[in-house]
Interface confidence: medium
């Protein structure tokens, strides 16, 4: 999906209202310096691409993020503020429903959510000239 035409400011507002707090809740008890941020993004569409990938694509050691509250709210925000996003996600959603529900907070998941926080931070505050 090409995130170029999303309403970035509306997504930012959704993040500030709820998603950010859910990420903090998920990471509670973890030190802010515990993980090195290795994932980066250069502009807002790129940040959303990386955010979508880390949030919804299962990775080795962390297969359960898509069911978390912050992930569901992220999905809702993208569906509302990115034209045509919902349509591209139907197949992905059906595939997700077939997987067993597994709510395990692994260290790998914590590391992944730490990466997500950095990506969201970058998305929300690109340097002023990029706005």
């Amino acid at each position: 999906y090409d995130f170029t035409n999303c309403d970035f400011e509306k997504i930012k507002a959704a993040y500030l209202s709820t998603i950010s707090k859910d990420l903090i809740t998920y990471m509670s008890g973890t030190k802010s310096t515990e993980f090195n941020n290795t994932v980066s993004c250069s502009n807002r569409p790129h940040c959303l691409t990386e955010i979508q990938s880390l949030t919804f694509n299962p990775t080795a050691g962390c297969a359960s993020l898509a069911k978390e509250m912050f992930a569901m709210k992220t999905k809702a925000a993208l569906a509302i503020w990115c034209p045509g996003y919902s349509e591209t996600q139907i197949n992905a959603t059906q595939a997700m429903k077939k997987r067993r529900k597994r709510k395990v907070t692994t260290n790998k998941c914590l590391e992944q959510v730490s990466q997500l926080q950095g990506l969201w931070r970058r998305f929300n505050r690109p340097l002023l000239k990029q706005q």
Epitope: E9, K10, K12, A13, Y15, L16, S20, S32, T33, F35, N36, N37, S40, S42, S114, Q117, G118, W120, R121, R122, F123, N124, R125, L127, L128, K129, Q131
Partner: antibody, heavy 120, light 111 residues
């Protein structure tokens, strides 16, 4: 503990340059925008510019664009602000500041300030 | 650039009194229903300290006697009952539009 520690006071001649450092600790330096703010005697606060350590991208207040250079050294989690062609009106306290965690656009952590005096 | 005008320039009050500081922007600092206006306190020889973010949210560790309100172009910082340590300079700041700007400050002094 999250903190920013700046280099010591400087006394410079007009026309010379000064480079102020700001060492970060207690947070993931590469994912926060780092800003520099000027506070001249008897004046208000003035934004100089910002840098994103993740890729070195910068944004400047047009007023300082020609004379200020912002850089970072990710290996030491240090931000730098170099000001060239110094003049008397550059006499001020210079602060580095971290932009907030969420992206609200406020400064939640500040350095202690570096006094730069420009005098012949 | 957005110009922030703070008033009054100096406010003389006594401990226990209520302080009302104003910040007016030359154009709206709102975006998608959020007001990107922040307030700082600065004491002599110290770095500024965040008081209020996004118009009305209390910064970490800031006493409840501080509050912020407003949207669009008009914003207010209120200190409900002044403590001796509240006498300082207060700045508003916007980051909605390039370049980021601060107000010129309001000095709150003991009467």
């Amino acid at each position: 503990e999250v903190q920013l520690v700046q280099s010591g006071a400087e006394v410079k001649k007009p026309g010379s340059s000064v480079k102020v450092s700001c060492k970060a600790s207690g947070f993931t330096f590469s994912t926060y925008n780092m800003h520099w703010v000027k506070h001249a005697p008897g004046q208000g606060l003035e934004w100089i510019g910002a840098i994103y350590p993740g890729n070195g991208e910068t944004s400047y207040n047009q007023k300082f664009k020609d004379r200020a250079t912002l850089t970072v050294d990710k290996s030491t989690s240090t931000a730098y602000m170099e000001l060239s062609s110094l003049r008397s009106e550059d006499t001020a306290v210079y602060y580095c500041a971290r932009e907030d965690d969420y992206g609200e656009g406020y400064f939640d952590v500040w350095g202690q300030g570096t006094t730069v005096t420009v005098s012949s | 650039e957005i110009v922030l005008t703070q008033s009054p320039a100096t406010l003389s009050l006594s401990p226990g009194e209520r302080a009302t500081l104003s910040c007016r922007a030359s154009e709206s600092v709102d975006n998608s229903g959020l007001s990107f206006m922040h307030w700082y306190q600065q004491k002599p020889g110290q770095a500024p300290r965040l008081l209020i973010y996004r118009a009305s949210n209390l910064g970490s560790g800031i006493p409840a006697r501080f509050s912020g309100s407003g949207s669009g172009t008009d914003f207010t910082l209120t200190i409900s009952s002044l403590e001796p340590e509240d006498f300082a300079v207060y700045y508003c700041q916007q980051i909605n539009t390039d370049p980021l700007t601060f107000g010129q400050g309001t000095k709150l002094e003991i009467k």
